[in-house]
């Protein structure tokens, strides 16, 4: 019963979950492993240590569940000193799904859209910097925001913790094993177990990452994340591991703000959003149209409707305002979802049929899904009409025709043009039937 | 890579300030570490005069804290240091770093009158 | 202040030989996040002093390894397994755990 059973303590400094199960309620240690500040890794049993090349990494592995999670690491830039996050994919069962750092996201290798639902996955973004895998069947939630170099492994709390394995360790609630290695034994020296779980890409290089340490300790902008501003998060997850990490890497302000990123989203995870950016430090730019919030909540609004289900919890990023809803990465008003846009720029309705500029035999319909389908019109063989005195029948086509039309036009060269009569007292001739082919005077 | 040039007078009278600049190249001042002002005096002696975190904040040696300032441009990619009251004994070769990694090739200051 | 105290001053070698700097502080040079901030120099005539060992036993990038550094809490040392000639010079060592940062007085590398 959790009312009267002991609530544990648990070593990865975070709060305990109830687990219902058919027997009666239980306390557990939430399976959460994270990697930030470009290469630290914090254990699912709160062990951490850094990752030291540019490389890919098995970050958690269940042979049960047919599910691997691989990290990809790689310089930031061409020559950079510093390694980022590049890529974070996950397999299951037949698919590979990969989340990308410029967020884009392939199955298979191929470009798909996002909210994106297939073999038992799920795939949804947030506020347009962190994408979340979950799998509804198996309770797993993994989420990677590329902009702060940071993941994050959900497991569920029902996970049977001895099927884990990789360099996110061992979700058992003690941390003396998590530096397991593929067979089984477990190791003491944190850089065996790196180099054991990592994997090489075909035609890919490990290089070290040969970033400077700092040499001169000033954690004056860690003190943050011990700040009366974070005291609610405090009481779910204790700082002092992120504060350990800060200060080892106080000198590099990109880590710095992707450590206290990494708590603060630890702490929205428990329900406690914190609003610790400023335009000044580690503030967040974001494209236009879109506007920062460090607390939404709901899922998020795309014009696909929302075909996948997402997390109840509050996130980071950037976002539409309250009237809009995103489409192609940026905010729209809600009616133009079902609108379509023609080559020449201009909006269609639903349903909506319209002639394109300058082909004239197409006929195109706005259809749902925003999709424009053309036809051409095929045009009858064009029947010559009969002409009067003088006119000869004349196909013609105007630019903006699609079909060509005969038309009766003046020929004076197979005219018998009557003469013109000569009057007298200075009086001239008139035309008696202006505008035709064959004069009468 | 980062590459550290200082700049400033050779000669200084003595009770007049003291301005050295030091213009950074191949990283920015405001991306992170450390930024140093330090001398050697004739004879090998260093002393640490103080830094510029990426920041912005300063922290000084306390023997000089009453006469020294450290500012930057970011702008320019440069950092400052400015000795007030100087004195025969401020006579010294003057390096700027990037924390340790990195030092300037020093410029050579006399005090004299 | 820390104070650095280093010996010898003057260390005459032959070329060949292993040479070994002492580096004593006078407090303890663990900061509390359990680093230990204490790094050796380099300095030729003419020239800036030049980064060595960091944090007591790293390598700087281009260091060959015959340079080596150890020690913890109050004393290090510096050592230099296979004296060359491009390894004259002043050696210092610096402490930047507690402001202010401090040097050592230096120990002058030189031939026999």
């Known amino acids: 019963n959790c009312d009267r059973g002991l609530r544990p303590s648990c070593p990865n400094s975070q709060s305990p979950v109830k687990v219902e199960e058919t027997c009666g309620c239980r306390w557990t240690c939430p399976c959460v492993c994270t990697g930030s500040s470009t290469r630290h890794i914090v254990t699912f049993d709160g062990q951490n240590f850094k990752l030291t090349g540019s490389c890919s990494y098995v970050l958690f592995q269940n042979k049960e569940q047919d599910l691997e999670v691989i990290l990809h690491n790689g310089a930031c830039s061409p020559g950079a000193r510093q390694g980022c996050m590049k890529s974070i994919e996950v397999k299951h069962s037949a698919l590979s799904v990969e989340l990308h750092s410029d967020m884009e996201v392939t199955v298979n290798g191929r470009l798909v859209s996002v909210p994106y639902v297939g073999g038992n996955m799920e795939v949804n973004v947030y506020g347009a910097i962190m994408h979340e895998v979950r799998f509804n069947h198996l309770g797993h939630i993994f989420t990677f925001t590329p902009q702060n170099n940071e993941f994050q492994l959900q497991l569920s709390p029902k996970t049977f913790a001895s099927k884990t394995y990789g360099l996110c360790g061992i979700c058992d609630e003690n941390g003396a094993n998590d530096f397991m290695l593929r067979d089984g034994t477990v190791t003491t020296d944190w850089k065996t177990l790196v180099q054991e779980w990592t994997v090489q890409r075909p035609g890919q290089t490990c290089q070290p990452i040969l970033e400077e340490q700092c040499l001169v300790p000033d954690s004056s902008h860690c003190q943050v994340l011990l700040l009366p501003l974070f005291a609610e998060c405090h009481k779910v997850l204790a700082p002092a591991t992120f504060y350990a990490i800060c200060q080892q890497d106080s000198c590099h302000q990109e880590q710095v703000c992707e450590v206290i990123a990494s708590y603060a989203h630890l702490c929205r995870t428990n329900g406690v959003c914190v609003d610790w950016r400023t335009p000044d430090f580690c503030a967040m730019s974001c494209p236009p149209s879109l506007v920062y919030n460090h607390c939404e909540h709901g899922c998020p609004r795309h014009c696909d409707g929302n075909v996948s289900s997402c997390g109840d919890h509050p996130s980071e990023g950037c976002f539409c305002p309250p009237d809009k809803v995103m489409l192609e990465g940026s905010c729209v008003p809600e009616e133009a979802c079902t609108q379509c846009i023609g080559e020449d720029g201009v909006q269609h309705q639903f349903l909506e049929a319209w002639v394109p500029d300058h082909q004239p035999c197409q006929i195109c319909t706005c259809l749902s899904g925003r999709k424009v389908n053309c036809t051409t019109q095929p045009c009858p063989t064009a029947k010559a009409p009969t002409c009067g005195l003088c006119e000869v029948a004349r196909l013609r086509q105007n630019a903006d025709q699609c079909c060509p039309e005969y038309e009766c036009v003046c020929d004076p060269v197979s005219c018998d043009l009557p003469p013109v009569p000569h009057c007298e007292r200075g009086l001239q001739p008139t035309l008696t039937n202006p505008g035709e082919c064959r004069p009468n005077f | 890579d980062v590459q550290l040039q200082e700049s400033g007078p050779d000669l200084v009278e003595p009770s007049q300030s003291l301005s050295l600049s030091c213009t950074v190249t191949g990283y920015s001042i405001t991306s992170g570490y450390s930024w140093h002002w330090i001398r050697q005096f004739p004879g090998n002696k260093l002393e640490w005069l103080g830094y510029i975190h990426y920041s912005g904040t300063t922290t000084y040696n306390p023997s000089l804290h009453s006469r020294v300032s450290i500012t930057r441009d970011t702008s320019k990619n440069q950092f400052f240091l400015q000795l007030n009251s100087v004195s025969t004994e401020d006579t010294a070769t003057y390096f700027c770093?990037?924390?340790?990694?990195?030092w300037g090739q020093g410029t050579t200051l006399t005090v004299s009158s | 202040d820390v104070v650095m105290t280093q010996t010898p001053l003057s260390l005459p070698v032959s070329l060949g030989d292993q040479a070994s700097i002492s580096c004593r502080s006078s407090?303890?040079?663990?900061?509390?996040?359990?680093?230990?901030?204490l790094h050796w120099y380099l300095q030729k005539p003419g020239q800036s002093p030049k980064l060595l060992i960091y944090?007591?036993?790293n390598r700087f990038s281009g260091v060959p390894d015959r340079f080596s550094g150890s020690g913890s809490g109050t004393d290090f040392t510096l050592k230099i397994s296979r004296v060359e000639a491009e390894d004259l010079g002043v050696y210092f060592c610096s402490q930047t755990t507690h402001v202010p940062l401090t040097f050592g007085g230096g120990t002058r590398l030189e031939i026999k």
């Open positions: 770093g990037r924390e340790g990694y990195h």
């Open positions: 407090q303890s040079l663990v900061h509390s996040i359990g680093n230990t901030y």
């Open positions: 944090k007591v036993s």
